[in-house]
């Protein structure tokens, strides 16, 4: 060390940490999910942890069953409070089929467009919540690869409720939903025993989503 070295009081540089994410939540709203307000409670608990705004995190929600509906776009609301009010009002649209590939593909192709509020250069995150094997699983591999090609980080949540209530094997279902999640799977895949248990994963899911902001 140079003999002229001096210790001076200095201010540490501001930590450069992007607080911007574009998050699209893809919700299975098919008939098997009950009670639906467990899903809206999950949304509420997750969204209230977010700092939502046009220069911060943006959230859009897509619901699917047989068809896909854009509940609201990424740029629709400019505060956490507004998003919470809107999310609470989301009704279960139903459907006898679970078209998960269609839901994910629609989110990628439509929800993540600039027209719907996606921002250039901002990290894209998709959260997929479903309670059953997809009826269009032959399309899933390609749809997931398309998301991968567009650098969309995916968190997937398997609700085992209808399987457990029906005493059905969850093995195939869990494998499918794991395949949707980004790598490493153990950090991006969640499963819950039933709809009521969705709220129990919010803290961990939130932390893992926010960890992306720092990368």
């Amino acid at each position: 060390v140079s003999p002229t070295f001096q210790v001076v009081n200095s201010i540490a540089p501001v930590q450069e940490c992007s607080t911007q994410l574009d998050i699209v939540i893809v919700l299975d709203g098919s008939n098997s999910i009950y009670p639906w307000d467990s899903v809206t409670a999950f949304l509420n608990d997750l969204l209230e942890r977010m700092d939502i705004g046009p220069k911060q995190t943006q959230v859009g929600i897509v619901q699917y069953g047989e068809n896909v509906t854009h509940e609201f776009n990424l740029n629709k609301y400019s505060s956490t409070e507004e998003v919470l009010v809107a999310a609470k009002k989301i009704v279960q649209r139903g459907g006898r089929q679970t078209m998960t590939a269609l839901g994910i593909d629609t989110a990628r192709k439509e929800a993540f467009t600039e027209a719907r509020g996606a921002r250039r250069g901002v990290k894209k995150v998709m959260v997929i919540v479903t309670d059953g094997e997809s009826h269009d699983n032959h399309r899933l591999k390609k749809v997931i690869q398309d998301c991968e090609d567009e650098n969309i980080q995916r968190f997937s949540i398997a609700i085992l409720g209808s399987y457990n209530r029906g005493n059905l094997s969850t093995e195939k279902f869990v494998e499918e939903i794991k395949s949707i999640a980004s790598e490493p799977t153990e950090k991006h895949f969640f499963n819950v025993s039933d709809e009521l248990a969705l709220v129990t994963i919010v803290k961990t899911l939130g932390e893992r989503i926010f960890a992306l902001e720092a990368t």
């Epitope: 639906w36 009704v91 457990n164």
Partner: antibody, heavy 124, light 108 residues
Amino acid sequence: QVQLQQSGPGLVKPSETLSLTCTVSGASISSYYWSWIRQPAGKGLEWIGRIYASGSTNYNPSLKSRVTMSVDTSKSQFSLNLSSVTAADTAVYYCAREGWERLQDYYYYGLDVWGQGTTVTVSS
Amino acid sequence: EIVLTQSPGTLSLSPGERATLSCRASQSVSRNYLAWNQQKPGQAPRLLIYGASSRATGIPDRFSGSGSGTDFTLTISRLEPEDFAVYYCQQYGSSPLTFGGGTKVEIK
């Protein structure tokens, strides 16, 4: 057929905890959500909350701070604890099943099977 | 929470007559998850109708339910002596589950 058999004390002292148990027969406890409902004499019905076999719960916000539900799948039983009771908690307490069926689609029936009811009086 | 308002409070009718009971919700009931229950003195409620219009197992076809959204109706086409009781509507589409105040169907 499905039967729900309720048990527990009929008299509870003020400030103590009311504890009731419901034993399920004729149906798998893991296949349904299970609810507790109460009805003060001559009045209407009030839903207390629900529980699933995993232990997941959902309580009525009006009672949430005092309610605890639990389940013992090995005994096919689920239970209700209501703490810090007052005379206002005097009522007939019912357990019930939230029915569902998968035919060509999923059908949810609401509270389709009820226990016989337990009259609980809060008094010193 | 969804508030359910039943009318009339009491319905005085004779056996053989038609009974029409109304239930109005303060907001739309999700997926029309509305049930009708019958309760007789000293007994637990009994499910009659689920999903607004489907009859529960073993319920006679003189009982029918209709309506959607916020307005629901239970109709008993021809009252039998055993039908005189209190009827409650109940929504199970959102938590907390809520019940109407009840309609008492009494013998005129």
